[in-house]
Interface confidence: low
């Protein structure tokens, strides 16, 4: 039950290791509950970074220890991933599921390549 999901191709994390991007989905139905999952693909492995289920019009609620935060507006989800380091550079895929009510729809974006550059240590000052 496919649904189109769009996300930017490339995002550069800031110096504090935070990257934000928009995940937009073309909703074929009137969903009241939506689940958004961020997946990371690297070295042919796919791992779940974070996930949240939210009511349309309400805030996304990730687990307390999640590295993700987000807000929703209509069919757009603004996702922020924090605490990234250079080794976390990779393809971050947005998966959206219209959970409730039926019919169920699921869509997976093409992924956002997030580049993370560790900041240079500050030189010692005399």
């Amino acid at each position: 039950k496919a649904m189109h999901v769009a996300q930017p191709a490339v995002v550069l994390a800031n110096s504090r290791g935070t990257a934000s991007f928009v995940c937009e989905y073309a909703s074929p139905g009137k969903a009241t509950e939506v689940r958004v999952t961020v997946l990371r693909q690297a070295d042919s492995q796919v791992t779940e970074v974070c996930a949240a289920t939210y009511m349309m019009g309400n805030e996304l609620t990730f687990l307390d220890d999640s590295i993700c935060t987000g807000t929703s507006s209509g069919n757009q989800v603004n996702l922020t991933i924090q605490g990234l380091r250079a080794m976390d550079t990779g393809l971050y895929i947005c998966k959206v599921e219209l959970m409730y009510p039926p019919p169920y729809y699921m869509g997976i974006g093409n992924g956002t390549q997030i580049y993370v550059i560790d900041p240079e240590p500050c030189p010692d000052s005399d």
Partner: antibody
């Protein structure tokens, strides 16, 4: 083993109220939507109400809208159906069912009989 | 609301017969349909989900087909334990609706 056990049925007068319960075990209750389905004596099956896993969304058949309220307590693994302003036509066996959304009901309780009569 | 028209409402058949029950939806429901068997005094039991997928533990003589608006439940060789009432259920959108049922009786 998945088990759904309904309780709370009985004889009630027209206009009265009753609360049905469905105790669930054998699965992660909060991960699944749940539904109530009823069957009047000698009749077919009629879907009554559904609630999403987190309890955020509820749906009702037109025949019970405004009179019945579905709810759940995920800490107690229990589903409820509060039935108010009961009518003779609400007389039925009420089943709770584990609701797999677009995949239907994979488990049902044994049912509890509600009789509305003066 | 989506109406589910099930036919026949009853049928008489013998052990070993091939039995076909149909359900027609008033609008397209993709393959969001299940078939349920109910015996007197018992809760319904799911036989088929997603129009054609066999529920685990259900004998392979039961099969389902169809998509959109036309659906069929087939029992390839009726067994004594298959005499029961069968219902289709559309699970595409609320309110969920059952077909009127088909009572399969012994000829």
């Amino acid at each position: 083993e998945v088990q759904l056990v309904e309780s709370g049925g009985g004889l009630v007068q027209p206009g009265g109220s009753l609360r049905l319960s469905c105790a669930a075990s054998g699965f992660t209750f909060s991960n699944y939507a749940m539904s109530w389905v009823r069957q009047a004596p000698g009749k077919g099956l009629e879907w009554v109400s559904a609630i999403s896993g987190g309890g955020l969304s509820t749906y009702y058949a037109d025949s019970v809208k405004g009179r019945f309220t579905i709810s759940r307590d995920n800490s107690k693994n229990t589903l409820y159906l509060q039935m108010n302003s009961l009518r003779a036509e609400d007389t039925a066996v009420y089943y709770c069912a584990k609701d797999l959304l677009w995949l239907g009901f994979d488990y049902w309780g044994q049912g509890t009989l509600v009789t509305v009569s003066s | 609301d989506i109406q589910m028209t099930q036919s026949p409402s009853s049928l008489s058949a013998s052990v070993g017969d091939r039995v076909t029950i149909t359900c027609r939806a008033s609008q397209a429901i993709r393959n969001d349909l299940g078939w349920y068997q109910q015996k007197p005094g018992k809760a319904p039991k799911r036989l088929i989900y997603a129009a054609s997928s066999l529920q685990s533990g259900v004998p392979p003589r039961f099969s389902g087909s169809g998509s959109g608006t036309e659906f069929t439940l087939t029992i390839s060789s009726l067994q004594p334990e298959d005499f029961a009432t069968y219902y289709c259920l559309q699970h595409n959108s609320y309110p969920l609706t059952f077909g009127g049922g088909t009572k399969v009786e012994i000829k």
